[in-house]
């Protein structure tokens, strides 16, 4: 790594993956192991994120980019850059302080994460219940009884929500 020649700031020519070493006459030195600099002109390198415990490594740290974490099986990522891992529950459950608990009657959760939500109230839209709700599925609303005349079109139930993955959001 050669010494930079910038008149303004001798550190400005230090590329990503290096730092401007004040202890060595502002020479561009490579980032030490387990550290990185993602932009040029940095005076220090950042310590790499450690994906430990409930976090696991999705992408290894390099000299120019931080490590990326996701969560171990049985947990899912939350937050920007997977800053948190939350325990999975089964469909039909929600996570409480005391662990996974079944959804109360009248509520459902079709994912392994999140909270139980109330069944749709079909009558608010002037419709009737075509398929009863369960802990895992919302009710399916059908046409109102008045619409059930010969020739009326059938109702297609909504597709189930996609299961969340374990990758960062």
């Amino acid at each position: 790594f050669e010494r930079t020649r910038s008149l303004q700031d001798p550190c400005s020519n230090c590329p990503a993956g290096t730092f401007c070493d004040n202890n060595r006459n502002q020479i561009c030195s490579p980032c030490p192991p387990n550290s990185f600099s993602s932009a040029g002109g940095q005076r220090t390198c950042d310590i790499c994120r450690q994906c430990k415990g409930v976090f696991r490594t999705r992408k290894e740290c390099s000299s120019t980019s931080n490590a990326e974490c996701d969560c171990t099986p049985g947990f899912h990522c939350l937050g920007a850059g997977c800053s948190m891992c939350e325990q999975d529950c089964k469909q039909g459950q929600e996570l409480t302080k005391k662990g996974c608990k079944d959804c109360c009657f009248g509520t459902f959760n079709d994912q392994k994460r999140g909270i139980c939500r109330p069944w749709t109230n079909c009558s608010l839209d002037g419709k009737s219940v075509l398929v009863n709700g369960t802990k895992e599925r919302d009710v399916v609303c059908g046409p109102s009884p008045a619409d059930l005349s010969p020739g009326a079109s059938s109702v297609t139930p909504p597709a189930p929500a996609r299961e969340p993955g374990h990758s960062p959001q």
Partner: antibody, heavy 116, light 107 residues
Framework: QVQLVQSGAEEKTPGASVKISCKAS????????IHWVRQAPGERPEWMGW????????RNSQKFQGRVTITWDTSASTAYMELSSLTSEDTGVYFC?????????WGQGTLVTVSS | DIVMTQSPSSLSASVGDRVTITCRAS??????LAWYQQKLGKAPNLLIY???NLQSGVPSRFSGSGSGTDFTLTISSLQPEDFATYYC?????????FGQGTKVEIK
């Protein structure tokens, strides 16, 4: 430079609700989290919950479950925190803070006073 | 919940002194630890994240170390503007929790 600007001080009576806003400006294009932290007089900060600006995902501390609602208005780049069923123990300063990892940018705080 | 305990709760020091504040977690948090400085009537200000990374714009006299359950914030040479309250905070497990604070006062 990221800036978080919170709404003004509030005085409430026990049993009431309070809704505080936190407007983000500057680099608000990235996917980041807005956390809410409260601090009672002379006490340590207490984490309340967060919302993700990208997908609206939100979680609250179990201590406040059922009493706190955190929302995000994308068009206004503003987070809101509503706390219901207030008691005198809810008196304190409420902060919003942005995080792409640590809580790196904070709002100025909103003083909430609950008294009869 | 993970309990964060700081020591000492307060200390008196002079300008130029080396100051060390410790923080202990009730269970292992790897390097998911941050340090904040808070002055009266102001929001906390991030100093150190991921145990030892200095936040941009923070003077190099602040440093952090540790791993697992025991962590340290060091101010190598105390300056007049450093008199404040310091908090550690873990972000390994929700709810994120803070230490009770260490107040650094002028001797």
């Amino acid at each position: 430079q990221v800036q978080l600007v919170q709404s003004g001080a509030e005085e409430k009576t026990p049993g009431a609700s309070v809704k505080i806003s936190c407007k983000a400006s500057g680099n608000t294009f990235n996917n980041y989290d807005i956390h809410w932290v409260r601090q009672a007089p002379g006490e340590r900060p207490e984490w309340m919950g967060w919302i993700n600006s990208g997908n609206g995902d939100t979680r609250n501390s179990q201590k406040f479950q059922g009493r706190v609602t955190i929302t995000w208005d994308t068009s206004a780049s503003t987070a809101y925190m509503e706390l219901s069923s207030l008691t005198s123990e809810d008196t304190g300063v409420y902060f919003c803070a942005r995080a792409e990892g640590p809580l790196d940018y904070w709002g100025q705080g909103t003083l909430v006073t609950v008294s009869s | 919940d993970i309990v964060m305990t700081q020591s000492p709760s307060s200390l008196s020091a002079s300008v130029g002194d080396r100051v060390t504040i410790t923080c202990r977690a009730s269970q292992g948090i790897y390097n998911y630890l941050a340090w904040y400085q808070q002055k009266l009537g102001k929001a906390p200000n991030l100093l150190i994240y991921a145990t030892s990374n200095l936040q941009s714009g923070v003077p190099s006299r602040f440093s952090g170390s540790g791993s697992g359950t025991d962590f340290t914030l060091t101010i190598s040479s105390l300056q007049p503007e450093d008199f404040a309250t310091y908090y550690c905070q873990q972000s390994y497990s929700t709810p994120w929790t803070f230490g009770q604070g260490t107040k650094v006062e002028i001797k």
